[in-house]
Amino acid sequence: PEPPTACREKQYLINSQCCSLCQPGQKLVSDCTEFTETECLPCGESEFLDTWNRETHCHQHKYCDPNLGLRVQQKGTSETDTICTCEEGWHCTSEACESCVLHRSCSPGFGVKQIATGVSDTICEPCPVGFFSNVSSAFEKCHPWTSCETKDLVVQQAGTNKTDVVCGPQDRLRA
């Protein structure tokens, strides 16, 4: 028969014959022969291969370096890489999460729209009219101005995006 020019899925062509690829979690030791199937062996501890492959070396699991603010979110297996995330209060600088930076704080006049996660930074928004924030915070939302009326008080000083209104007593009617 004619030697194959293409092979089925999960096979590869070598020396004019189709050999089975090694399954995820295993590396290639020797190609198949006319007598034997492909020789594959498992990846060692702290190694992985996540596809059907003909790799002669497994990949090293990612190291979550605590000096860069990283910690393990999901331990790697022979078929998956380790997933890193950032320590509390920090977030990844990239999708690959190779290092972390401190969560951004929202300045006075801005409130937190979305609290940061291990992979995304704080999202701030300006406090709209009727709301204020007088602190720099990674958690605080804009607070509504105090309603003087509900306290039977009147506005003595108008609020801003950074300050609350100041309420005071109503002027007494003179007899």
């Epitope: 030791v29 020797s30 190609d31 022969t33 007598f35 034997t36 062996l41 060692g44 002669t56 070396h57």
Partner: antibody
Amino acid sequence: EVQLEESGGDLVQPGASLRLSCAVSGFDFSSNAMSWVRQAPGKGLEWVSSIYAGSSGSTYYASWAKGRFTISKDASKTTLYLQMNSLRAEDTATYFCARGVTRLPLWGQGTLVTVSS
Amino acid sequence: DIVMTQSPSSLSASVGDRVTITCQASQSISSYLAWYQQKPGQAPKLLIYDASTLASGVPSRFSGSGSGTDFTLTISSLQPEDFATYYCQGTVYGSSTISAFGQGTKVVIK
């Protein structure tokens, strides 16, 4: 055609060194692990060493071979080597090269090493 | 190192006999066990690998079984060309790779 051909066997004195070669043809040398196995006259098979595939293939040895024997390969020459130092009378054997590690489907015909004074 | 203990070291049998050879590993080798046949003046020939997988071209009268430490080679009906020496090879695979052969079983005509 797949071929493994050993060479370098000789009659040497105890303490001498010898380098065996195994010329490989008919298959991709870079993606195949290789092993050396020896057989003393009238005796059984004895695993000596293995080298894994890839450019920086890991090497492994039987405990008695560690320190005296070194397995290596030259991908450009598609040749496997076994460097043997401080040879002893008990190293007298036919040395076979074979393809694989946990299974050895392809063997050379062997080269005879005789260590005698 | 790993030690592979093969038994018997020799056996006499007749054509048509069922022959069983055993191999015991000194530690678990999973299924990394192979069986070889060797005739005088020849290189060994692979019969079975991964404990029970028959190498292509090997007659179906040969079979292998076992895992861990205990393994068996069976020849269901001995043929004249089967008189030879048989070896098991076990491999410990992990952080290191160590292989070893059994001492061999010589099958002779009764």
